[in-house]
Interface confidence: medium
């Protein structure tokens, strides 16, 4: 699927748009809203009943080069006594984000947009149990 | 910018860092991942810290639709199915990159934008201090 074009009725001044070669698009990678203010609580990854660890993945041919991934620490959830309860499940919560991939083909360089699925944390769920008919 | 390893046989004109503006292919890799969290899993209903999903739509952005989570309760759901206020449902927020049409309404000109989304909720033990 390609990025959907906006219908021409939506344009105010199509002539003011920069010329772009067919099959490609112009992308400014100077990020808008670089400094977001996150109001998330502290240490929730350790205090959650479905705790998780963070791993930083690094790829020099990706922008941004650093992507942080979460991994659930347990299969079950942590109960009030601090013990793992395997009657419940710790499951990953995932979110898509975009990255720019830099590709080297011989001495030429091309850029490709890529969707990356990031695991942002974990939540504790009641398992789906299928009973034998 | 970030440093890119280069083929030593290539001319030295190539910049080691990502340029500020790049031309990218219109096709997106891994584009077929499911973008509707209501369809992709029912965790939002089965979680002990359940959440509702709200549709955030913006035609000037790609993806134009992003689903936002909002915790249903202050507390968490216990084994009896009741809300336990000794525990807290808290949102898990994540910064993601999207494309913003720039100039506005242009079909093939974009800028990366960082936005903050609430992805889901998790149940945490509250931080409380008791009287000594």
């Amino acid at each position: 699927r390609k990025i959907p074009k906006v219908g021409h009725t939506f344009f105010q001044k199509p002539e003011s748009c920069p010329p772009v070669p067919g099959g490609s698009m112009k992308l400014d990678i100077g990020i808008i809203n670089e400094n977001q203010r996150v109001s998330m609580s502290r240490n929730i990854e350790s205090r959650s009943t479905s705790p998780w660890n963070y791993t930083v993945t690094w790829d020099p041919n990706r922008y941004p080069s650093e992507v942080v991934q979460a991994q659930c620490r347990n299969l079950g959830c942590i109960n009030a006594q601090g013990k793992e309860d395997i009657s419940m499940n710790s499951v990953p919560i995932q979110q898509e984000t975009l990255v720019v991939r830099r590709k080297h083909q011989g001495c030429s360089v091309s850029f490709q947009l890529e969707k990356v699925l990031v695991t942002v944390g974990c939540t504790c769920v009641t398992p789906v149990i299928h009973h034998v008919q | 910018g970030i440093t890119i390893p280069r083929n030593p046989g290539c001319p030295n004109s190539e910049d080691k860092n990502f340029p500020r503006t790049v031309m990218v292919n219109l096709n997106i890799h891994n584009r077929n991942t499911n973008t509707n969290p209501k369809r992709s899993s029912d965790y939002y209903n089965r979680s002990t810290s359940p959440w509702n999903l709200h549709r955030n739509e913006d035609p000037e952005r790609y993806p134009s639709v992003i689903w936002e989570a909002k915790c249903r309760h202050l507390g968490c759901i216990n084994a009896d199915g009741n809300v336990d206020y000794h525990m807290n449902s808290v949102p898990i927020q994540q910064e993601i990159l999207v494309l913003r049409r720039e100039p506005p309404h242009c079909p093939n000109s974009f800028r990366l934008e960082k936005i903050l989304v609430s992805v889901g909720c998790t149940c945490v033990t509250p931080i409380v201090h008791h009287v000594a």
Partner: antibody, heavy 124, light 111 residues
Framework: EVQLLESGGGVVQPGRSLRLSCAAS????????MHWVRQAPGKGLEWVAV????????YYADSVKGRFTISRDNSKNTLYLEMNSLRPEDTAVYYC?????????????????WGQGTTVTVSS | QSVLTQPPSASGTPGQTVSISCSGS????????VDWYQQVPGAAPKLLIY???QRPSGVPDRFSGSQSGTSASLAISGLQSEDEADYYC???????????FGSGTKVTVLG
């Protein structure tokens, strides 16, 4: 009884400083996020700042950012608002308020206890 | 100019139901719970509703809150003369990085 008592208001010239205090009693102060909210004469409520239960998170309204500092002393059960470079538009009744739920909910979920307010007048 | 929009005034006769709307966006009401406050002249505000629809103890059940998408509303049923006051909605806003109050609605009890 849960109580908040503000003090430190008064008349001050533009450009000068003032420090407001809010003494808390009747609850475990160090468990709760605390806010400052102001109300200019004849106007609506305007949020000023918030501090988390342990002081690690602080947020400010754009109108006061860089001029006002929120802080707390959990050993004294007291909340503070240091106001520098005061302007006439800072003239208002200043209220301190307690977040309704402990721990994580420093940024939302209702301000369930309010002080009676202290008046700050910035005038030359 | 508040990012939470409320009608400046609302009115009703005793016994009637009055509703106050609060319109926001995805960065506030769409993502965070809404609180409602009542303020009678000369007094400090009082928490009326928290977490969209929860009533603190002591608040009559004539007051109810609801939220849908990026809007919220407060309903006062069986309107009484003591309900005459200013009402404010409020929530956290991620774009501003702060708690925000609505512009306020003055409720008048007629007759």
């Amino acid at each position: 009884e849960v109580q908040l008592l503000e003090s430190g208001g008064g008349v001050v010239q533009p450009g000068r400083s003032l420090r407001l205090s809010c003494a808390a009693s009747g609850f475990i102060f160090r468990n709760y996020g605390m806010h400052w909210v102001r109300q200019a004469p004849g106007k609506g409520l305007e949020w000023v700042a918030v501090i988390s239960y342990d002081g690690s998170n602080k947020y400010y309204a754009d109108s006061v950012k860089g001029r006002f500092t929120i802080s707390r002393d959990n050993s004294k059960n007291t909340l503070y608002l240091e106001m520098n470079s005061l302007r006439p538009e800072d003239t208002a009744v200043y209220y301190c308020a307690k977040v309704g739920a402990s721990g994580d909910y420093y940024y939302s979920y209702g301000l369930d206890v309010w002080g009676q307010g202290t008046t700050v007048t910035v005038s030359s | 100019q508040s990012v939470l929009t409320q009608p400046p005034s609302a009115s009703g006769t005793p016994g009637q139901t009055v509703s106050i709307s609060c319109s926001g966006s995805n960065s506030n009401i769409g993502r965070h719970p809404v609180d409602w406050y009542q303020q009678v002249p000369g007094a400090a505000p009082k928490l009326l509703i928290y977490y969209d629809d929860q009533r603190p103890s002591g608040v009559p059940d004539r007051f109810s809150g609801s939220q849908s998408g990026t809007s919220a509303s407060l309903a006062i049923s069986g309107l009484q003369s003591e309900d005459e006051a200013d009402y404010y909605c409020a929530t956290w806003d991620d774009s501003l990085g702060g708690y925000v109050f609505g512009s306020g609605t003055k409720v008048t009890v007629l007759g």
